[in-house]
Amino acid sequence: EDELQVIQPEKSVSVAAGESATLRCAMTSLIPVGPIMWFRGAGAGRELIYNQKEGHFPRVTTVSELTKRNNLDFSISISNITPADAGTYYCVKFRKGSPDDVEFKSGAGTELSVRAKPS
């Protein structure tokens, strides 16, 4: 069976301030089991944007219904974009682990740029 791939189809997305940004991400497999997370930036200082498992992320909504058992679409929409949201966003698949989940595979990243709000 082919190993899971994380596909972020857009290398970049440009959004006007105040609008919503949709960041697309798809998996090619449901295995290994484990959560999806979105981060802004890479490395130790990356910022958690969304965690499928837990947490409250009021500006983030998932595009697909993640409670579907066969769901492979982990795209998100971030509302009320501001210039501070600019950066590269990574969709990351974790595989289950005990006590901590283990990062399994990351998408290539999508760079979000923020345009000035039209006057």
Partner: antibody, heavy 118, light 107 residues
Framework: DVQLVESGGGVVRPGESLRLSCAAS????????MSWVRQAPGKGLEWLAG????????YYIDSVKGRFTISRDNSKNSLYLQVNSLTAEDTAVYYC???????????WGLGTLVTVSS | ALTQPASVSANPGETVKITCSGG??????YGWYQQKSPGSAPVTVI????KRPSDIPSRFSGSASGSAATLTITGVRVEDEAVYYC???????????FGAGTTLTVL
Amino acid sequence: DVQLVESGGGVVRPGESLRLSCAASGFTFSSYAMSWVRQAPGKGLEWLAGISAGGSDTYYIDSVKGRFTISRDNSKNSLYLQVNSLTAEDTAVYYCARETWNHLFDYWGLGTLVTVSS
Amino acid sequence: ALTQPASVSANPGETVKITCSGGGYYSTYYGWYQQKSPGSAPVTVIHSDDKRPSDIPSRFSGSASGSAATLTITGVRVEDEAVYYCAGYDGRTYINTFGAGTTLTVL
């Protein structure tokens, strides 16, 4: 507090049908997948069916496919199980359960007893 | 199918381990459910292999390794007497499966 309250059980004859209900409160019902699990007298727990939060996707154990139907009405915070062509083997306590993000269970109802007897 | 022992027994204060085998490690999440009497509502003691609900005492813990999961009760109490069911969710089949249950007797 999360509460799940089943109803609709009772004594029926073989071949008859029932609609079981589960009233949910204490959480945002429309955000959670739900399942039905049963326990026959003297037996263990048996998962029957699950449904996604929006209700568009349903999943069944092979032995009840085509005979049981899981559904939900998010406007009423209610989960349902339509059980048709009942047999004595369907005699059990039927529980509804809230699913975790990965389709296990965190909260359970008290159950409703279905007895199939001629 | 998930396999667990039919029964285990322990004295108060001892550590009890109940195993559940038969799932694939990379495709299955495990949970553990306590039922104190037949027909009574099950209580979730562990989900997602090792996650304990906030209202469950810390003496209950869970782990998973290889194709098996383990429920550990450290310092078992008389009130822990119950049947413990393991369950798995398999990401390949979208199906939940329960083990047959393990009766814990506290002597």
